[in-house]
Interface confidence: low
């Protein structure tokens, strides 16, 4: 209630001889600071005096005395909260109780405090979990009600009298609810831990003993066995006798049932600790354990692998991989159920057999056609040879061989022949399903393999085939050599360089671009007359008379072929030149009169001039010369001369008669 | 003399993989079947996996199967155990042990073994 001071501090606090004490506490006084503070040893209140009686341990006051004890004990409290306590070192003769006379200005209080001093270090007490299993992590608590900060201590474990490796937790409480030192320890107890000795150790700062506690560990744990088995190698033949037997080394709780398993799977009627198989045929052959339960689980032995030792069962051959490419690699394996293992193997080859292959693989690194067909092999260990099995078939594909191009056509073949070729291999595997052909044409495949080539071309020189399944094989291309008549025939000038004049040597050269075959002969025409024979048309002095259109031919054994006809042109100065007269050479005067200035030339006269009977030329430059009217006087011998760009040429003399008209007569 | 050399082992991840050798010398190794035993801390030994002399036939642990693969090389006298997806249960000293009886042999029991290798650790963890 509301007259009460209130304190806060542990009920009884616990230390031994020589050891100290440690006393948190807390106070809230009535009114005011604290004046006055005694503490005793077992108090008696006298009714008499109205004060406390006993010893006195120590004491503050306002005047400051303080007794000797005081060294020992230490108040190290404050006025109006804290009365914490310490003693050190502590006596037996310290136990009893405490009493703490507080007095403020108006009120007074006297508070009660347990004090238990044993003569020798109490032991700490070891807490267990209620139950323990094997590898089930547990704690392990060890209490002392025991805490000063001017004493030291440490809690150690111990198993079996060896300190634990694992780490514990120390921890420590010095508060007004609780004052202790605890040591906390994880630990997974495996089941040979059970019935083991747990010790906590309490110590000194030195390590020096002090006192312990002790339990005994009950470990829960599933039965632990060992089997035996007789033979000791669990190898025998078949219609031998096994034995097996199986011990518990431990268990707690005890054992309920027993039971045998082989490969995982209960044994029926096998309940007994020994287990025995009489007449044992291969199929016994397995793992063997024995099954032990209690209340926590089963327990199970090792496992004893029983080797029922038989000749090899009749082999099969495992192929990788078939089908095989031609030139791959491909292994065998022999595999064959045997105990023991075989040792020897002999391998066949399309029921033949393959010399020098023992083992239970054959490698082959480079895979030809003919190791296709059928392989098989026999085991062999100590107890016996096993049978030839069915063996497996090995298909080893390759692309088509020896691939040819065969003309099917009589030779030689002709431009514009129909050609028929076919494409040809040796074997295949798998079979051929197409053709290709090179070069690329508008050509039929009338069937399978064979291509039909309508109008050969002069220039088709060179086809190759290909006969496909997975891949594609060529042939070497073959040749058609087809045979022409001469192609591009034509004249070329060889010389001269320039325009031909003439007089000049001229030679003509008849070219054409190929023939086959190579052998030819030559014809030159003009106007559908035969020349000659040889390549080139030669004129040591050309004549304008040669000019015309030219043709050569050129012939070989197919056909013969003839160029575009080729223009021959000379030039030459104006030649033949006369002056003819129109309407005649006598003329009545007062008539027309025409003289025209006729020539050979070429290139054309491009210029004419006229000259009279004195050699005076006349101002007139065409062609023809026009007299109207005509007069007597122009009777006369007049020529011409034509010019071109080769040079000039002259007529001769022609006279023109002029004679008088009848009127004219008549006058005279 | 005769020697079984293990090496390969080391510190993996759980889920990563290794691959122990085992090289043979001073004896002839092809005539021998080969097996992996390991031996956790504070465990027993306990039977890994078994392979025939020519390498055709192989046996495993239940607890290896599907993760563990072992192979021989007669021409290099050297037994292989390729291990995947390890677990850290698997944590142990592998050792490679070799018999010169002609079939599946299947022990954990050290002298049931004609030769013995002196072991590699191996430590999976995160």
């Known amino acids: 209630d509301s007259s009460k001071w209130v304190f806060e501090h542990p009920e009884t606090l616990y230390a031994w001889e020589g050891a100290c004490v440690w006393i948190p506490c807390t106070y809230r006084a009535l009114d005011g600071d604290l004046e006055s503070f005694i503490l005793f040893h077992n108090p008696e209140y006298n009714k008499n005096t109205s004060k406390f009686d006993g010893t006195r341990l120590y004491e503050s006051t306002k005047d400051g005395k303080v007794p000797s004890e005081q060294k020992r004990v230490q108040f190290l409290g404050d006025k109006n909260k804290n009365c914490t306590l310490s003693i050190h070192p502590v006596h037996l003769n310290d136990s009893g109780q405490l009493g703490l006379r507080m007095e403020s200005k108006t009120e007074k209080w006297m508070e009660r405090i347990h004090l238990n001093v044993s003569e020798r270090p109490f032991p700490p007490h070891i807490q267990l979990p209620p139950e323990i299993q094997e590898s089930q992590e547990v704690t392990l608590t060890c209490l002392l009600n025991f805490s000063c900060y001017g004493y030291p201590i440490q809690l150690q474990w111990l198993l079996e009298g060896v300190p634990m490796r694992q780490a514990a937790v120390t921890s420590t409480s010095l508060t007004i609810k609780s004052v202790f030192t605890r040591s906390e320890l994880k630990f997974s107890p495996q089941w040979s831990h059970h019935g083991k000795i747990v010790t906590c150790q309490l110590q000194d700062a030195d390590g020096k003993f002090l006192s312990n506690d002790t339990v005994q560990l009950n470990v829960k744990h599933t039965p632990k066995l060992e089997i035996k088995v007789t033979p000791s190698d669990a190898i025998v033949r078949e219609g031998d006798s096994v034995t097996m037997t199986c011990e518990v080394s431990s268990s707690n709780p005890e054992y309920t049932t027993v039971s045998w398993l082989k490969d995982g799977t209960s044994l029926k009627k096998q309940n007994t600790f020994t287990l025995n198989l009489r007449e044992v045929t291969k199929d016994q052959s397995g793992k063997y354990c024995c099954q032990v339960s209690n209340d926590v689980g089963p327990g199970r032995s090792e496992e004893v692998f029983l080797q029922v030792q038989y000749a090899p069962e009749p082999s099969t051959v495992q192929i990788l991989h078939s089908p095989a490419v031609e030139g791959s690699q491909v292994e065998f394996l022999c595999m064959s159920l045997a105990n023991p293992l075989p040792t020897n193997y002999t391998w066949y080859h399309n029921g033949k057999e393959m010399q020098g292959r023992t083992e239970e693989k054959v490698h082959i690194p480079k895979i030809l056609p003919w190791h296709a067909g059928t392989y098989s092999c026999v085991a062999e260990n100590i107890l016996g040879t096993g049978q030839r099995g069915p063996g497996a078939e090995l298909d080893v594909q390759y692309p088509p061989k020896k691939v040819t191009t065969v003309i099917q056509n009589p030779m030689p073949i002709r431009e514009g022949d129909t050609v028929t070729l076919s494409c040809n291999y040796n074997s295949s595997n798998p079979s051929v399903t197409r053709y290709e052909w090179k070069p690329h044409g508008a050509w039929e495949e009338p069937s399978l393999g064979v291509l039909k080539i309508q109008n050969v071309g002069w220039d088709n020189t060179t086809i190759a085939c290909a006969a496909c399944n997975s891949w594609c094989s060529w042939a070497s291309p073959v040749a058609l050599n087809v045979q022409y008549a001469p192609r591009d025939v034509r004249v070329r000038k060889i010389k001269p360089l320039s325009e031909i004049h003439s007089g000049n040597s001229v030679s003509l050269q008849c070219d054409f671009s190929s023939s086959h075959p190579k052998e030819v002969q030559f014809f030159w025409e003009k106007n559908g007359r035969l020349l000659g024979k040889e390549s080139q048309l030669n004129f040591d002095s050309i004549s304008p008379e040669d000019a015309g259109s030219y043709s050569c031919w050129v012939n070989n054994s197919i056909g013969q072929t003839a160029s575009k006809a080729w223009t021959l042109e000379v030039l030459y100065a104006p030649r033949r030149l006369r002056v003819s007269m129109s309407p005649g050479d006598q003329v009545m005067e007062g008539k027309s009169a025409t003289l025209t200035c006729e020539s050979d030339a070429n290139p054309p006269v491009s210029h004419y001039t006229w000259f009279d009977w004195n050699n005076q030329s006349l101002p007139y430059h065409s062609q023809k010369l026009r007299l109207e009217p005509v007069k007597v006087q122009h009777s006369g011998a007049y020529w011409c001369q034509g010019t071109n760009s080769v040079g000039k040429g002259r007529s001769p003399l022609s006279t023109l008669t002029v004679y008088y008209s009848p009127e004219t007569i008549g006058r005279r | 003399q005769v020697q079984l050399v293990e090496s390969g082992g080391g510190l993996v991840q759980p889920g990563g993989s290794l691959t122990l050798s085992c090289a043979a010398s001073g004896f002839d190794f092809s005539f021998y079947t080969m097996t992996w035993v390991r031996q956790a801390q504070g465990k027993g030994l306990e039977w890994v996996s078994t392979i025939s002399t020519g390498g055709g036939g192989s046996n495993y642990a239940d607890s290896v199967k599907g993760r563990f693969t072992i192979s021989r090389d007669n021409a290099k006298k050297t037994l292989y155990l390729q291990m995947t997806s390890l677990k850290p249960e698997d944590t142990a000293v592998y050792y490679c042990?070799?018999?010169?009886?002609?079939?599946?042999?299947?022990?954990?029991?050290?002298?049931?073994?004609?030769?013995w290798g002196r072991g590699t650790q191996v430590t999976v963890s995160s």
């Open positions: 042990a070799s018999h010169r009886r002609g079939y599946m042999f299947v022990s954990s029991r050290k002298n049931e073994y004609d030769y």
